[in-house]
């Protein structure tokens, strides 16, 4: 296993709507074709799996129907975009990704992306 | 080094707007956020909000939404703070910080406002 | 709204003794998001302690935050003289963002 860097922004404030865009930046050592990007979160000092998804360059990132993850890639980039977020979901969110073909293997875990979530205002009662 | 610096000191008449600046050095601009603070004289610390500077998104304190606006200018690195309709008790210190993943730091030099007739 | 309440308001010490400051919310806090800010007169604060209780980077080792959910502290284990100053905590897990009023650390 050989290490790599990777680049992801430290602070992100989610829209109104609770959806969190960032990049994830990968150095390629070499040409890898398969690649498999794996978002986790941190809080309170546990680590939780959000979305994971393998992809061949070139190629739509494909998650699973249920996922809160959707992303496209471009070259060493994964524009990640995380929806359904609300305030309770704040927290610090790790880009890992791994090489997975041809050998050698690459890991690389960026330093996370602080997500801040803020629930909207309630709508004042209106009488009508 | 990482360093903030904040736009002089303005005086303003009430009712008008003032609009300050923060120029933000030695780090990656668009990977943090700046959050605004405000100081009456002789007051505690009061927080006005923050603005990503990745997308542009804001969080504004809710006594004064509808008068602040928060904005960045990364091609200079630059954030501001628009506060509009001007009162009295509008004049503090204001100051910007950065915002780390979860840590504020450092903090501008401050920008005097003094809201007199 | 989280309320942050620092006690007492002012501590009266001598260099070389030990200060201890409150700050309680009046919700849980994570303690993630609990900071804590010197500021002397004339200055803008000065960043000591993060995530309840990691030190900011030239931070003297004499300075340590503790404390979870409502309850946090700070101390100072021996008051050197630039310490004297006032102290805020602030909350940023929940908005709005918090402050507590401050607690004045003052000479004896």
């Known amino acids: 296993c050989k290490a790599m860097h990777v680049a992801q922004p430290a602070v992100v404030l989610a829209s109104s709507r609770g959806i969190a865009s960032f990049v994830c930046e990968y150095a390629s050592p070499g040409k890898a074709t398969e690649v498999r990007v794996t978002v986790l979160r941190q809080a309170d000092s546990q680590v939780t799996e959000v979305c994971a998804a393998t992809y061949m360059m070139g190629n739509e990132l494909t998650f699973l129907d249920d996922s809160i993850c959707t992303g496209t890639s471009s070259g060493n980039q994964v524009n990640l975009t995380i929806q359904g977020l609300r305030a309770m979901d704040t927290g610090l969110y790790i880009c890992k990704v791994e090489l997975m073909y041809p050998p050698p293997y690459y890991l690389g875990i960026g330093n996370g992306t602080q997500i801040y979530v803020i629930d909207p205002e309630p709508c004042p009662d209106s009488d009508f | 080094q990482v360093q903030l610096v904040q736009s002089g000191a303005e005086v303003k008449k009430p009712g008008a707007s003032v609009k300050v600046s923060c120029k933000a050095s030695?780090?990656?601009?668009?990977?943090?956020?700046i959050s605004w603070v405000r100081q009456a004289p002789g007051q505690g610390l009061e927080w006005m909000g923050w603005i990503s500077a990745y997308n542009g998104n804001t969080n504004y304190a809710q006594k004064l939404q509808g008068r602040v606006t928060m904005t960045t200018d990364t091609s200079t690195n630059t954030a501001y703070m628009e506060l509009r309709s001007l009162r009295s008790d509008d004049t503090a210190v204001y100051y910007c910080v950065r915002v780390g993943a979860n840590w504020f730091d450092p903090w501008g030099q401050g920008t005097l406002v003094t809201v007199s007739s | 709204e989280i309320v942050l309440t620092q006690s007492p308001g002012t501590l009266s010490l001598s260099p070389g003794e030990r200060a201890t400051l409150s700050c309680r919310a009046s919700?849980?806090?994570?303690?993630?998001?609990l900071a804590w800010y010197q500021q002397k007169p004339g200055q803008a604060p000065r960043l000591l302690i993060y995530g309840a209780s990691s030190r900011a980077t030239g931070i003297p080792d004499r300075f340590s935050g503790s404390g979870s959910g409502t309850d946090f502290t700070l101390t100072i284990s021996r008051l050197e003289p630039e310490d004297f100053a006032v102290y805020y905590c602030?909350?940023?897990?929940?908005?709005?963002?918090?402050f507590g009023q401050g607690t004045k650390v003052e000479i004896k």
């Open positions: 602030q909350q940023y897990g929940s908005s709005p963002w918090t």
């Open positions: 030695g780090y990656t601009f668009t990977s943090y956020g």
């Open positions: 919700q849980s806090v994570s303690s993630s998001y």
